[in-house]
Amino acid sequence: APTSSSTKKTQLQLEHLLLDLQMILNGINNYKNPKLTRMLTFKFYMPKKATELKHLQCLEEELKPLEEVLNLAQSKNFHLRPRDLISNINVIVLELKGSETTFMCEYADETATIVEFLNRWITFCQSIISTLT
């Protein structure tokens, strides 16, 4: 059974992940981003189901494409270094989903824009955090 300290650690990691995803979304989904129109042409795979930590496997598998799109975004309003940012997210995702269980991600038929993709995983984090608090 999960202890209160492990639950607290999970909550903090989810809050960190949520913050990272929101910062990315804020950096790209705004009228000051010169590359937004181009970035919206890239397609991302969405999870068929995302209700448990193991489903973060679906996010992990899309981190490389996410980094490639973020490499376009360097501007006055986007100061984060995509490689470092994605690396940080990857570390958190690996810790949260656990590496001992292998989970095959199932994707939805419809692909999504980067904005829809980020919003989906932001909602996921918020939802799990709310069950922990």
Epitope: L19, N26, G27, N30, Y31, P34, N77, I122
Partner: antibody, heavy 122, light 111 residues
Framework: QVQLVESGGGVVQPGRSLRLSCAAS????????MHWVRQAPGKGLEWVAV????????YYADSVKGRFTISRDNSKNTLFLQMNSLRAEDTAVYYC???????????????WGQGTTVTVSS | DIVMTQTPLSSPVTLGQPASISCRSS???????????LSWLHQRPGQPPRLLIY???NRFSGVPDRFSGSGAGTDFTLKISRVEAEDVGVYYC????????FGQGTKVEIK
């Protein structure tokens, strides 16, 4: 002094078109992004559209996407809003506002016009 | 879209007394450039809005120092230290971190 003056408002029937203008003076118009923001009678503010300083990018609120077009003529220091397929819910005072996001201070929407009234009614 | 929620929606105040308006965003407003694009606008009856505060706490030029802004993350506050007659009207918070959205407005009137 820095000034924005909107014009082109009026009463129009649903489905018809209208073109709003915003004349800028007292500043280097071509250095600023420009927005249209509207306010329905007795309601709050709603962002409508934005255009980059050089006209290279434009974005719209979902409520007007595909019906409204924002444009600018930097040689004439003028901003435009072409409004097609007008609906009753487009009835509002339309304001233009400048935005200096490329400036050092980055004030945001720091100068607003007096507004022009658009009434969509049959 | 980021939803901005203001409280209270109406605030009757006494001249010379302080007033405070809160604004909450549905998600954090910190941008990847480190800035938080949260502004406060004031609109008098029959007038266009005018900028008071930008980036949480910076007073725009010509704005009296009785106005101050504070906050972080998702929670922001506009304070008027001593309300004057010319301060009546509607106050809006606005975010431009993503595409611009406004709070519903808070009507400040004299008791």
């Amino acid at each position: 002094q820095v000034q924005l003056v909107e014009s082109g408002g009026g009463v129009v029937q649903p489905g018809r078109s209208l073109r709003l203008s915003c004349a800028a003076s007292g500043f280097t118009f071509s250095s600023y992004g420009m927005h249209w923001v509207r306010q329905a009678p007795g309601k709050g503010l709603e962002w409508v559209a934005v255009i980059w300083y050089d006209g290279s990018n434009e974005y719209y609120a979902d409520s007007v996407k595909g019906r409204f077009t924002i444009s600018r003529d930097n040689s004439k220091n003028t901003l435009f809003l072409q409004m097609n397929s007008l609906r009753a819910e487009d009835t509002a005072v339309y304001y233009c506002a400048r935005d200096d996001w490329f400036g050092e201070a980055d004030y945001g929407m720091d100068v607003w016009g007096q507004g022009t009234t658009v009434t969509v009614s049959s | 879209d980021i939803v901005m929620t203001q409280t209270p929606l109406s605030s009757p105040v006494t001249l010379g007394q302080p007033a405070s308006i809160s604004c909450r965003s549905s998600q954090i407003l910190v941008n990847s450039d480190g800035n938080t694009y949260l502004s406060w606008l004031h609109q008098r009856p029959g007038q266009p809005p005018r900028l008071l505060i930008y980036k949480i706490s910076n007073r725009f030029s010509g704005v009296p120092d009785r106005f101050s802004g504070s906050g972080a993350g998702t929670d922001f506050t506009l304070k008027i230290s001593r309300v004057e007659a010319e301060d009546v009207g509607v106050y809006y918070c606005m975010q431009t971190t993503q595409f611009p959205t406004f709070g519903q407005g808070t009507k400040v009137e004299i008791k």
